[in-house]
């Protein structure tokens, strides 16, 4: 059943003489493996003998390879499902049908393959796209039915015979469907490509020209124009005329009208390659160009600049800026309509001629309130000289000058006045506005730029004011050199650095923090009486009588100031001590004695100790000393020491008598 | 300015004695007591005792009694600390100091006793 | 006699921070207590006497407090130069006692 036979393979295959034929081929004989195989060159059947005559190309056996005559046809498939060929070279007797015999165990099948062998390379065909407009890439395509392993060939671009710039790419294609050679060329055409021959060339390995085709490229472009002017450099004075003439160079299509722009706009009732200006004013200045259309769309000419020159008119100034801060920098600028532009200027301040301004800018790099006022400018070209314009008005503006603070009281000023002071300042733009005062305090001002200051402190030691525009001046400080008593008088203790005992050189020092005027006297008294005049109070040797509360006094012009009472304590050992007997010296035998160790210390005495008359100390340490019943033997002479933290006293010896009572004298 | 001047560094054998002085300027002696104070290296301070150069009067605490005797010059406005018996214990600086609670101080006298 | 227990014996703190020494007599003592202050190599500086009159020149951050028994020196805000070892002193009876010292150093 021969439909069990499917082949797959180009239906013909091209060649030239001595080239070569690759021929993609697939099958399948569904009944088995392919056993013989046989190429025919032009088969024909003989129904007599029931078989294909013709050439045998090649020929394979189960049994092994027939060896062929030419090692030029290779069957290079394989027994199930490859039946692909290759011719090498290939000769134009080739031309015609080749037959595939194939023979499987039970089935038997011819195939069918037309080869078109020419005598020379034949050419390749070039596809363009329908239309090609400038500037627009298009593909350009080169086409050759043909391609095969064992001869390499390649295809070239040329434009007008030149090898194309462009990047070419290549593809072949070796296939059951198809079997071919393409370049494809991606171009962008100009107008001026229009016309103009394009050529791919076949060439083999070697680069050695096999053939071609040509196309001439139809570039699609608005119309190509060229602009001329009388005078050619377009270059004329007011009344003068001006012929402009456009020509095409190239459109295609045709081109169907024509216009005329000055400075981009369309120039009404001018639809002629002719443009006539009679009589030009110097508003027809500008950029001409003419514009003629075709159904790509509008071409346009280069664009010529007429110039119409003419005197400077009346000039402008300009300022950067104005109103300007002293110090700053300004620019001025003359502004005058002229053609060509003016090459010389005049400057003015205030009508009055700027020596050495000549340029069109005049730069001032630190302005200063002397360059206020109004500036003109006068421009100057080869046609004339324009007329001075109305100038511009510089306005320079300044923090207040001169500021100074002013105290309007007779002097001196003593603490607790009313002191009133005003802020002068010499000039100032803008005007001053307000004013301020350092320090700043609750200050009264009455009046602007004046400021009254009721119960002066000692303290306010100077005031400046600021007069104040735009920004603030400041005046320098003025001292108001208020006079007051002095201030802070207090005692200091100088030596000893702690306590003072009695005996100590002591030195008190009345200090004070400040006074003015600085001339001053001291006073120092104790319980309302003078004691000395001098800053320190000096005891060479401090008595406890010398205790007590002091102070000392500061006086000035303006006051005197007294320190707080300080008191001044005097450490010192028990002194004065005695011994006091109750009920007295001479006491009755059985009766109470006691003794009393009276003594002047500070601190008090804290521990007292009793000696009796062999200096033997008694085992009694309290100030009263109590002996009861007394006793005969316990007459004699007494004593007792006084400590505190200071040091020790001793009294003198006080006898005590005691005397029989009437009993024991009965008794004798 | 109150000053105490104390005698220079004293280095002397055990067992021997040793006389410290201490001079008043800016001030007389007699003003007030003159206390003396021992401080050991690196230790705290200890009073010792006092004179008042006035009268000779003189207090000395228990444990440097025995030890340590006070006395004054008042014409050379100089109190003197002798001490005696000396060992490694006595080495101290020894402070002169006077009035009030101990407000002005002399400098120091380093005592080393080493043999 | 009397004797003065100090605390503490060392102590590390602060610049800027409020130090407190303290003082304890075995027996009242009538506020009759002087601190004082010595620095290596020195002679003590009396800073306060009477518990809490401070001595004239002595920065004002020093202070005392205290009665009876118990005493105290603060030193409100640390500085530098306050380090050092401080000592108490009582001067209400003889023989005069010292507290056993405090070595304050910056932290």
């Known amino acids: 059943d021969s439909s069990k036979w499917v082949f797959e393979h180009p239906e013909t295959l091209y060649a030239w003489e001595g080239a070569c034929v690759w021929i993609p081929c697939t099958y399948r004989a569904l009944d088995g493996d392919l056993e013989s195989f046989i190429l025919f060159h032009n088969p024909e059947y003989n129904k007599n003998t029931s078989k294909f005559d013709g050439t045998r190309l090649y020929e394979s056996t189960k049994d092994g390879k027939v060896p062929s005559e030419q090692k030029r046809v290779q069957f290079l498939g394989d027994k199930n499902k490859n039946c692909t060929l290759s011719i090498h070279p290939v000769h134009l007797n080739d031309s015609g049908q080749l037959g595939l015999r194939m023979e499987s165990k039970t089935e038997k099948w011819m195939e069918r393959i037309h080869l078109n062998v020419s005598e020379r390379p034949f050419p390749p065909h070039i596809q363009l796209p329908p239309e090609i407009q400038e500037s627009q890439e298009v593909t350009l395509t080169c086409l050759l039915n043909f391609s095969c392993y064992g001869y390499p060939i390649q295809l070239q671009w040329l434009l007008e015979g030149v090898p194309m710039r462009q990047a070419a790419v290549t593809s072949t294609s070796l296939t059951i469907k198809s079997v071919f050679t393409r370049s494809e060329l991606k171009f962008s055409p100009q107008w001026s490509h229009h016309g103009k021959i394009v050529t791919c060339q076949l060439q083999d390995a070697d680069g050695k020209f096999l053939s071609n085709d040509t196309v001439q490229l139809n570039v699609k472009h608005t119309p190509k124009l060229e602009i001329k002017v009388t005078p050619s450099d377009a270059i004329v004075r007011e009344g003068d005329s001006v012929t402009m003439t456009c020509e095409v160079s190239s459109s295609n299509p045709e081109y169907t009208t024509v216009s005329w722009l000055k400075d981009g706009t369309s120039l009404k009732k001018q639809n002629t390659f002719t443009l006539n200006l009679r009589e030009v004013t110097k508003d027809q200045s500008g950029k001409y160009c003419c514009q003629v259309s075709n159904d790509v769309g509008p071409g346009r000419s280069e664009e010529v600049f007429l110039q119409v020159q003419y005197a400077p008119e009346p000039s402008t100034v300009q300022i950067l800026h104005s109103p300007a801060v002293e110090g700053s920098q300004v620019e001025f600028l003359c502004m005058s309509l002229a053609n060509p532009l003016p090459t010389n200027y005049t400057w003015y301040h205030n009508g009055k001629e700027m020596q050495g301004r000549t340029e069109e800018k005049v730069h001032i790099p630190k302005i200063l309130p002397w360059h206020a006022g109004t500036y003109s400018c006068v421009a100057e070209n080869i046609l004339g000289t324009g007329q001075r314009g109305p100038g511009a008005e510089l306005d320079v503006q300044y923090p207040p000058k001169k500021v100074t603070t002013v105290i309007q009281n007779p002097m001196p000023i003593r603490e607790g006045d009313t002191v009133t002071l005003s802020c002068n300042y010499n000039s100032s733009n803008p005007s001053v506005t307000r004013y301020e005062w350092k320090p700043h305090g609750a200050w009264e001002e009455p009046s602007l730029g004046v400021l009254k200051i009721q119960n002066v402190g000692w303290d306010n030691t100077t005031i400046a004011c600021a007069a104040c525009n735009s920004w603030c001046s400041w005046a320098s400080p003025v001292a108001l050199n208020v006079q007051y008593a002095p201030r802070d008088v207090r005692v200091r203790k100088i030596k000893p650095l702690s306590e003072i005992h009695s005996g100590n050189s002591v030195s008190l020092q009345c200090d004070f923090s400040s006074s003015h005027p600085k001339e001053v006297q001291f006073f120092w008294e104790k319980n309302g009486r003078l004691l000395g005049k001098e800053s320190q109070l000096n005891f060479d040797s401090i008595s406890p009588e010398d205790a007590g509360s002091y102070s000392c006094w500061v006086n000035n012009s303006i006051g005197q100031t007294a320190s707080k009472a300080w008191t001044l304590e005097v450490l010192y050992a028990p002194r004065r001590l005695r011994v006091s007997m109750s009920p007295g010296d001479q006491v009755m035998e059985g009766k109470s004695a006691t003794l009393t160790c009276e003594s002047d210390a500070n601190p008090p005495v804290s521990h007292y100790t009793w000696f009796d008359w062999n200096n033997q100390s008694l085992p009694y340490h309290s100030q009263k000393l109590r002996l009861e019943p007394v006793k005969v033997q316990h007459s004699g002479a007494y004593w007792c020491q006084g400590t505190n933290s200071v040091g020790k006293g001793r009294s003198p010896l006080s006898t005590l008598t005691v005397y029989y009572s009437p009993e024991t004298i009965g008794r004798r | 300015a109150v000053q105490l001047q104390q005698s220079g560094v004293e280095l002397v054998r055990p067992g021997a004695s040793v006389k410290l002085s201490c001079t008043g300027s800016?001030?007389?002696?007699?003003?007030?007591?003159i206390h003396w104070v021992k401080q050991r290296p690196e230790q705290g301070l200890e009073w010792i005792g006092w004179?008042?150069?006035?009268?000779?009067?003189?207090e000395y605490a228990s444990k440097f009694q025995g030890k340590a005797t006070i006395t004054a010059d008042t014409s050379s406005n100089t109190a003197y600390l002798q001490l005696s018996s000396l060992t490694s214990e006595d080495t101290a600086v020894y402070y002169c100091?006077?009035?009030?609670?101990?407000?002005?101080w002399g400098q120091g006298t380093t005592l080393t006793v080493s043999s | 006699d009397i004797k003065m227990t100090q605390s503490p014996s060392s102590m590390y703190a602060f610049l800027g921070e409020r130090v407190t020494i303290t003082c304890k007599a075995s027996?009242?003592?009538?506020?009759?207590l002087t601190w004082f202050q010595q620095k290596p190599g020195k002679s003590p500086k009396t800073l306060i006497y009477?518990?809490?009159r401070l001595v004239d020149g002595v920065p004002s951050r020093f202070s005392g407090s205290g009665s009876g028994q118990d005493y105290s020196l603060t030193i409100s805000s640390l500085e530098y130069e306050d380090v050092g070892i401080y000592y108490c002193?009582?001067?209400?009876?003889?023989?005069?006692?010292f507290g056993g010292g405090t070595k304050l150093e910056i932290k």
């Open positions: 027996q009242g003592i009538n506020s009759f």
């Open positions: 002193l009582q001067y209400d009876e003889f023989p005069r006692t």
């Open positions: 004179i008042d150069p006035e009268n000779g009067d003189t």
């Open positions: 009477r518990a809490n």
């Open positions: 100091a006077t009035y009030g609670s101990l407000d002005y």
């Open positions: 800016d001030f007389n002696i007699k003003e007030d007591y």
